[in-house]
């Protein structure tokens, strides 16, 4: 129902703590360069204003839309043009154009330093001094680096962070308690970020229909006992929640997500037998738990898919009557039978089915034409299955670091024009798929691998969009979202690329590398590997292995030497010469 004051309504629904957290996230995602203190001041002002509206909904300005209220706040920031350049032009527009303008200026790769974690003692001290401010900093730092992070989920991760600090700061050895736990949260949060960005890309580029199709497939896999009407209702609600979050309407998004969680818990009987443990949890944990709940047991008596979608006389009539509903039921029926497929694959199959009906239903004898459609799915299914097998075998043989290097070589050959930092980031992320997915049971590998790769490749596309340099990448990124991963997999060495000339300084290292954390050392070595491939795109795996082994040996020797600087300055040039010879 309509509320006199939208801001009062949301404040009442969400409560002060979540309200403030969400407003902070919203501001941090819009204005990514502002300091925590600047945003905290704005959040306090907005919260105080919300309270006046709660007290009297008829008070001045309380009837204004949230976009108007938040936009006015952001536009009142001093030095907006100096700090944000043309984003300041958004402030000359009226709503809803102003908000659209803010959204278009969100930067997926802001030039901010990496979020460094303070050492344990310092963290615990500032956490104990002021837990609210500490968590505010966390929300601000994550939100500004990830401008599409799913806001209610970020509140959940902040809560996790809080619980870990509360527990570990009471321990004698804070460091060994905090590090693995916070690393775990960080890893999950980063995956959550790329997944949500993929959802927003789907929504932005292809609209609500595309996202809803994704949701129908995903929900049907998870809740195979729910009927089509129930799945459609959940998909519609989930689409609304995601549309709001992707559109910057974070208060509405969090409120509607809480409503959806409530609905699911009140209707477990018609949705799934696996929800009870989630439903016993408090709000943030409940919604998070529901979002990754295990698949319900598939009904035993499901008829073959062919009955309704190939053998039925009425196929074309049913398709003509309501195309979207008929295709939706196909996607639902196929997905609930295949929790072992990725959502991307299921959407490709639905697309193939749609194309077949479009072609066949226009013919004089449609059944003869679409009768083989399920057999035609086979190559579409085999391709990702082979991808999983090949890559998991390689991961098991090489381990995560070696697997990342193999991917780095492969992708540098596919798109050598892409900047080395982007290639290294992409390869490291793509390489993590091994650790994340290849250790899972067989029937869970394909959905894990393909849907994760799709999300990572979406980030590659977003970064490439800013500065397009590779025709290969542009080609794969301009197609539909579900075709991206197969497109990238099919790319081969870019024959149009003119190899980079060999620059000795690119492969010159100094003793400071010895004191770097292992992750940073790996990145340095992977940067060198990408540069080698750019210099010799057709180098064999054997040649590259020889060079990288030599490089690793060089680092090991010099980092153990008594006089590291001398070792690096004398052995370095020799290494460069050997590299050139090995690749000649």
């Amino acid at each position: 129902e309509a509320h006199k004051s939208e801001i009062a309504h949301r404040y009442n629904d969400l409560g002060e703590q979540h309200f403030k957290g969400l407003v902070l996230i919203a501001f941090s995602q819009y204005l990514q360069k502002c300091s925590y203190d600047e945003h905290a001041k704005l959040v306090q002002e907005v919260t105080d204003f919300a309270k006046t509206c709660v007290a009297d909904e008829s008070a001045a300005n309380c009837d204004k839309s949230l976009h108007t209220l938040f936009g006015d706040k952001l536009c009142a920031i001093p030095n907006l043009r100096e700090n944000y350049g043309e984003l300041a032009d958004c402030c000359t527009k009226q709503e809803p154009e102003r908000n659209e303008c803010f959204l278009q200026h969100k930067d997926d790769n802001p030039s901010l330093p990496p979020f460094e974690r303070p050492e344990a003692e310092a963290m615990c001290t500032s956490f104990k001094e002021n837990p609210t401010t500490f968590m505010g900093h966390y929300l601000h730092e994550v939100a500004r680096r990830h401008p599409y992070f799913y806001a209610p989920e970020l509140l959940y991760y902040a809560e996790q962070y809080n619980e870990i600090l509360t527990q570990c700061c009471a321990e004698a050895d804070k460091e060994s308690c905090l590090t693995p736990k916070l690393d775990g949260v960080k890893e999950k949060a980063l995956v959550s970020s790329v997944r949500q960005r993929m959802k927003c890309s789907s929504m932005q580029k292809f609209g609500e229909r595309a996202f809803k199709a994704w949701a129908v497939a995903r929900l049907s896999q998870t809740f195979p006992n729910a009927d089509f009407a129930e799945i459609t209702k959940l998909a519609t609600d989930l689409t609304k929640v995601n549309k709001e979050c992707c559109h910057g309407d974070l208060l509405e998004c969090a409120d509607d997500r809480a409503e959806l969680a409530k609905y699911m818990c009140e209707n477990q009987a018609t949705i799934s037998s696996k929800l009870q443990t989630c439903c016993d949890k408090p709000l943030l944990k409940k919604a998070h738990c529901l979002s990754e709940v295990e698949h319900d047991t598939m009904p035993a008596d499901l008829p073959a898919i062919a009955a309704d979608f190939v053998e039925d006389q009425e196929v074309c009539k049913n398709y003509a009557e309501a195309k979207d509903v008929f295709l939706g039921t196909f996607l639902y029926e196929y997905s609930r039978r295949h929790p072992d497929y990725s959502v991307s694959l299921l959407l490709r199959l639905a697309k193939k089915y749609e194309a077949t009906l479009e072609k066949c239903c226009a013919e004089a004898n449609p059944p003869a034409c679409y009768g083989t459609v399920l057999a035609e799915f086979q190559p579409l299914v085999e391709e990702p299955k082979n991808l999983v097998k090949t890559n998991c075998d390689l991961y098991e043989k090489l381990g995560e670091y070696g697997f990342q290097n193999a991917i780095l070589v492969r992708y540098t050959q596919k798109a050598p024009q892409v900047s080395t930092p982007t290639l290294v980031e992409a390869a490291r992320n793509l390489g993590r798929v091994g650790t994340k997915c290849c250790t899972l049971p067989e029937d869970q590998r394909l959905p894990c691998v393909e849907d994760y790769l799709s999300a990572i490749l979406n980030r590659v596309c977003l970064l490439h969009e800013k500065t397009p340099v590779s025709e290969h990448v542009t080609k794969c990124c301009s197609g539909s979202l579900v075709e991206r991963r197969p497109c990238f997999s099919a790319l081969t060495v870019d024959e149009t690329y003119v190899p980079k000339e060999f620059k000795a300084e690119t492969f010159t290292f100094h003793s400071d590398i010895c004191t770097l954390p292992e992750k940073e050392k790996q990145i340095k070595k992977q940067t060198a590997l990408a540069e080698l491939v750019k210099h010799k795109p057709k180098a064999t795996a054997e040649q590259l292995k020889t060079v990288m082994d030599d490089f690793a040996q060089f680092l090991d020797t010099c980092c153990k030497a008594a006089d590291k600087d001398t070792c690096f300055s004398t052995e370095g040039p020799n290494l460069v010469t050997r590299c050139k010879d090995a690749l000649a």
């Epitope: 196929v315 074309c316 398709y319 003509a320």
Partner: nanobody, 115 residues
């Protein structure tokens, strides 16, 4: 909502002619192949003829080949069946269907061939 409305049936003497029409609405008519199906009293449905969405490809049951002609006007969203040299065994309710369906989703139009 898909609607198919047949017309043009009637009583005709053996050897006579009739032209049946089927007015379609509620779907993209030109994207779908269409069929004529008939059902004689006490019998199951029998497929008569089919035409593709563009009107180029036509097919006929052996029993009507050379006597019946199927056509369509996509601008008018109408399907036709020109029936010549009618025989008593052509007596049936004729109805049009979408795609390869033979099940009846409309009223149909009665064709009676009798002297």
């Amino acid at each position: 909502q898909v609607q198919l409305v047949e017309s043009g049936g009637g009583l005709v003497q053996p050897g006579g002619s009739l032209r049946l029409s089927c007015a379609a609405s509620g779907f993209t008519f030109g994207s779908f192949g269409m069929s004529w199906v008939r059902q004689a009293p006490g019998k199951g449905p029998e497929w008569v003829s089919a035409i593709d969405g563009g009107g180029a490809d036509t097919r006929y049951a052996e029993s009507v080949k050379g006597r019946f002609t199927i056509s369509r006007d996509n601008a008018k969203k109408t399907l036709y069946l020109q029936m010549n040299s009618l025989k008593p065994e052509d007596t049936a309710v004729y109805y049009c269907t979408i795609g390869g369906s033979t099940s009846r989703g409309s009223q149909g139009t009665q064709v009676t061939v009798s002297s």
